[in-house]
């Protein structure tokens, strides 16, 4: 309805100024031009427009740039970034790290995690690098956002960022993400030795292959049961009882409390009961003695 009204004579603004705060909403709709707003974003931020008025301005900009805002405008957004949705941001093309850092500052403490993550993802998609400065600019946002990036975006995250990742950050990661992050972590921690290496890499072990876990079992790491439970089932079931015993060390006793839960249960199902009995923990669920295991998981040659 407001769209239908014409701009009253003499009300057409040639610049963004304080007079606009006294315009009725329908007048803003009828009179204000999106390209003028884009050119004078600094003034839009400076003048005390109401949220309602800024929403009208946003609607104007969205109509002017239906394919997403140009980078020249994104660089000038300032506080106006707070009115932009993650969906809007996904349409953008951002190549300047300074633009990203500036907007991350604006979003800090504003319950804008989704926008901040979308902005960084968009920057990575354009070939940008997520450096440690940027991770610091993301501030208190848990690094679980790494799991929101596409696998392609993850490739451009430098290995050094892995030093900042905590155990809870990867809880919602897909198996594919975990695999990629594990590779990055291996490269980040390659110069760390012994137990310190294990302490760093254990956060990422959900992405480790059976081969990696076998290698780890040779190093007396005494993995705790919480880390063991985070290992991917496909890797775990390939380990023998002896290898798991080496991997867990004295923590092997904790398998008993987890024997009816995945992934421990899945691993037990693939072990011979006689091997489990040798542990002396009373673990049940293994392959009964004298049974032959046939693997029907043979891939067909033609599909």
């Amino acid at each position: 309805d407001a769209e239908q009204k014409a701009c009253p004579p003499g009300k057409e603004p040639y610049k963004v100024d304080e007079d606009l705060i006294f315009y009725q909403n329908w007048e803003l709709e009828a009179c204000v031009d999106g390209t003028m707003l884009a050119r004078q974003m600094d003034l839009v931020n400076e003048i005390p427009f109401t949220y309602e008025q800024l929403s009208i301005f946003k609607h104007k900009l969205d109509k002017t740039y239906p394919q997403g805002y140009p980078e020249s405008l994104i660089q000038q957004l300032g506080h106006f970034f707070r009115y932009v949705s993650p969906e809007d941001i996904h349409q953008w093309n951002v190549t300047s790290p300074d633009t990203v850092k500036t907007l991350l500052k604006v979003s800090k403490g504003q319950k804008m995690n989704a926008q901040a993550i979308a902005l960084v993802a968009c920057y990575l998609r354009g070939g940008g690098q997520l450096d440690e400065d940027m991770v610091k600019a993301l501030g208190d946002i848990p690094l679980s956002y790494l799991c929101d990036f596409s696998p392609q975006d993850l490739h451009s995250v430098p290995s050094s960022v892995m030093w900042l990742v905590g155990p809870q950050d990867l809880d919602k990661c897909s198996q594919r993400h975990l695999g990629l992050l594990y590779q990055k972590a291996c490269s980040a921690f390659q110069n760390v030795s012994g137990l310190e290496y294990f302490e760093k890499i254990k956060t990422f072990l959900g992405g480790a292959s059976v081969k990696d876990l076998r290698a780890l079992s040779q190093h007396n790491v005494s993995m705790d049961i919480a880390t063991f439970k985070r290992l991917q089932v496909d890797s775990l079931v390939g380990l023998s009882v002896a290898e798991v015993q080496k991997l867990l060390g004295p923590n092997i006793v904790d398998l008993k409390t987890e024997e009816d839960k995945s992934p421990v249960r899945d691993w037990l199902f693939r072990q011979h009961q006689k091997d489990l009995d040798r542990l002396g923990l009373g673990l049940q669920g293994g392959i009964p003695n004298g049974y032959l295991v046939l693997d029907f998981n043979v891939r067909e040659a033609f599909s």
């Epitope: 005390p48 427009f49 109401t50 949220y51 309602e52 009115y83």
Partner: nanobody
């Protein structure tokens, strides 16, 4: 969340004065600026005056020189001092706080100026 409660409205003669108060509570730190708006029956709400966090003030042409907006940070209150009132100043006056990501409004206080 920000809560706003207006007071000070009433019935006065043309030429007299009134002072409206707006008591602010809640997440005050999130407020960017505040304003007084008025609404006549059947009309769109219009801005009368605005004050920013640093104290810069803005006035609509129809109240310039007669109305003054001010704030008392210690009391978390914004005022609108209205002098030389005219019958056309009659309406419901609303206090508004702009924060991220919304505008918060009070319930309004009626001002009636009789000739």
């Amino acid at each position: 969340e920000v809560q706003l409660v207006e007071s000070g409205g009433g019935l006065v003669q043309a030429g007299e004065s009134l002072r409206l108060s707006c008591a602010v509570s809640g997440n005050i730190g999130s407020i960017r600026h505040m304003g007084w708006h008025r609404q006549d029956p059947g009309k769109e709400r219009e801005l009368v005056a605005t004050i920013t966090t640093v104290g810069t003030t803005y006035y609509a042409n129809f109240v310039k020189g007669r109305f003054t907006i001010s704030r008392d940070n210690a009391k978390n209150t914004v005022y609108l001092q209205m002098n030389s009132l005219k019958p056309e100043d009659t309406g419901v006056y609303y206090c508004r706080a702009t924060a991220h990501p919304t505008d918060y409004w009070g319930q309004g206080t009626q001002v009636t100026v009789s000739s």
